[in-house]
Amino acid sequence: MMTGTIETTGNISAEKGGSIILQCHLSSTTAQVTQVNWEQQDQLLAICNADLGWHISPSFKDRVAPGPGLGLTLQSLTVNDTGEYFCIYHTYPDGTYTGRIFLEVLESSVAEHGARFQIP
């Protein structure tokens, strides 16, 4: 029985050239987190593993920094970074929890944070 919920930063926007923190939070479960994956569409950005620590995909090494916590910081944003991002929590014994974040990278200075929402 999967009782946990993932809270994410939801729909967010940021300025081109700036940076943004993607964050997910798993709650309402006593399951142990064994690994967290961060993905952009079908591309793996980073992994944080309980035994191995962080691994940043080579193609993103210059623009992605881990943290804070299990979050991910995207730097030097381009309009091509617009899209869906997923945090995938691998847990024991519950299984996998997935959270979704939509990032829009704007040319102008009108970027504003969207509301938070929960994915059961």
């Epitope: 939070h25 709650s27 987190v33 944080c48």
Partner: antibody, heavy 117, light 107 residues
């Protein structure tokens, strides 16, 4: 097994600088954040900053931004903290500690820094 | 910066008693709260991660609860080795911060 080795003590003069080291072993050094935390005598724990050895990314508490510099030598799996313009207020035990999936599962033994003339 | 306030500052108890230590955050930190024990002249030791998750090698008498801004570390049937300082710490955002600590002493 995971180990974070720190020198036992350092004695420096007021106004001088110090470089504290933390040698890591037993794990992949570039895959974990290294944090620095200090504790004045009989006081609480104070977060100084952190560095991700895989990229050199750093974060600092505002209090240490102008005086503290964190660096790593990945070839020797060593993290360093450089602290300048020292005063007696900087006398404390300085710990290094790592963070992966969660903080702070392993700690160094701490370096006792004494700032005195 | 997120401020963590621990209470009480000092707690005098007898071995065998059960206690609850409090940690309150100045803003919502979800479950990004961790508990540490520190004995005199020793490095801190991680007891509980993410508010309630157990750590391998830590006795089951230590447990954590809470989310958001209010957190509790509970110790059931205290043993003499349990006395010392207890700190909470948040990893929700940088700069990471610690609570001021609770000293658990033998009555």
């Amino acid at each position: 097994q995971v180990q974070l080795q720190q020198p036992g003590s350092e004695l420096v003069r007021p106004g001088a600088s110090v470089k504290l080291s933390c040698k890591a072993s037993g794990y992949t050094f570039t895959s974990y954040w290294m944090h620095w935390v200090r504790q004045r005598h009989g006081q609480g724990l104070e977060w100084i900053g952190n560095i991700f050895p895989g990229s050199g990314t750093t974060n600092y508490d505002e209090k240490f931004k102008n005086r503290g510099t964190l660096t790593v030598d990945t070839s020797s799996s060593t993290a360093n903290m450089h602290l300048s313009s020292l005063t007696s207020e900087d006398s404390a035990v300085y710990y290094c500690t790592r963070e992966g999936l969660y903080p702070f599962d392993y700690w160094g033994q701490g370096t006792t820094l004494t700032v005195s003339s | 910066d997120i401020v963590l306030t621990q209470s009480p500052a000092t707690l005098s108890v007898t071995p065998g008693d059960s206690v609850s230590l409090s940690c309150r955050a100045s803003q919502n930190i979800r479950n990004n709260l961790h508990w540490f024990q520190q004995k005199s002249h020793e490095s801190p030791r991680l007891l509980i991660k993410y508010a309630s998750q157990s750590i391998s090698g830590i006795p089951s008498r230590f447990s954590g609860s809470g989310s958001g801004t209010d957190f509790t570390l509970s110790i059931n049937s205290l043993e003499t080795e349990d006395f010392g300082m207890f700190f909470c710490q948040q990893s929700n955002s940088w700069p990471y911060t610690f609570g001021g600590g609770t000293k658990l002493e033998i009555k």
